[in-house]
């Protein structure tokens, strides 16, 4: 009566501060509307990174000022988080909710540890 959600254990952000991972859920029903939320857990503090509700077969739409983008394919959501800095290193948890039609189902992944390493500043060049 609950939904299983799978996501990778570890992801390393690119030097440009971009991290991507797949959040996959085993839908117990034929949902037409799904909500995906990314939560960040660090030092027992939880913050909502971003959230999007989408109709099956349509694209995810995050708010304009969101640091997340994503695409969906069946029961898979490909999430990309941008603008990450070293201080954003933490556990990023995928929460999936089947919103419509009833019944509602909730699924929470075990989290993806995203490591972010700030790039070294370019040394001054002497010519």
């Amino acid at each position: 009566k609950a939904m299983h959600v799978a996501q990778p254990a570890v992801v390393l952000a690119s030097s440009r501060g971009i991290a991507s991972f797949v959040c996959e859920y085993a839908s117990p029903g034929k949902a037409t509307e799904v909500r995906v939320t990314v939560l960040r857990q660090a030092d027992s503090q939880v913050t909502e990174v971003c959230a999007a509700t989408y109709m099956m077969g349509n694209e995810l739409t995050f708010l304009d000022d969101s640091i997340c983008t994503g695409t969906s394919s069946g029961n898979q959501v490909n999430l990309t988080i941008q603008g990450l800095r070293a201080m954003d290193t933490g556990l990023y948890i995928c929460k999936v909710e089947l919103m419509y039609p009833p019944p509602y189902y909730l699924g929470i992944g075990n989290g993806t540890q995203i490591y972010v390493i700030d790039p070294e500043p370019c040394p001054d060049s002497d010519f």
Partner: antibody
Framework: QVQLVESGGGVVQPGRSLRLSCAAS????????MHWVRQAPGKGLEWVAV????????HYADSVEGRFTLSRDNSKNTLYLQMNSLRAEDTAVYYC????????????WGQGTLVTVSS | EIVLTQSPGTLSLSPGERATLSCRAS???????LAWYQQKPGQAPRLLIY???SRATGIPDRFSGSGSGTDFTLTISRLEPEDFAVYYC?????????FGPGTKVDIK
Amino acid sequence: QVQLVESGGGVVQPGRSLRLSCAASGFTLSNYGMHWVRQAPGKGLEWVAVIWYDGRNKHYADSVEGRFTLSRDNSKNTLYLQMNSLRAEDTAVYYCARGGVWGSYFDYWGQGTLVTVSS
Amino acid sequence: EIVLTQSPGTLSLSPGERATLSCRASQSVSSSYLAWYQQKPGQAPRLLIYGSSSRATGIPDRFSGSGSGTDFTLTISRLEPEDFAVYYCQHYGSSPFTFGPGTKVDIK
């Protein structure tokens, strides 16, 4: 700090209607699932209904489906429960409760408002 | 619909004793989606535990939750006078979000 305050309870005859309000402060309603839970006198807790996030999706317990309707006024940060065709078995204290970050457990509750359905 | 059964119905104990409350589900419930509440007469319920074992903000560490599948337990390691109340379990993995009938912990 988070606060939920219910109002609108009272005595009503069977078959009549009543509207309950839940004024929220300290957070934004649209970021959470907002629930109503009721408790008949001397009985346990019964989940009644939820309105989700943007307010488009609502789910109801079978016992109230088709009779109760949830709505929300974002400008007032207030939740409403419209109760129609009331029955004696709807007599209860009605609590407004906020769903948690990790799911629909209820991390904050109002003080409750008593609805008595009696002729 | 998941049906939750709580036992015992009433638990009579003295302050300082250990209380063990049981919640059994009619079908398997992920441990991530089970909560416990405390309710005192005339008051709204108060969240104690969510996710089967995570204590809510401000809840003392004498309260602990455990379990998986269909069997869950709330333990109060040493009962304080303010702990005598009714305790409810609740699942929230899917709707409807049902509660157990409650266990009353009273003073022996």
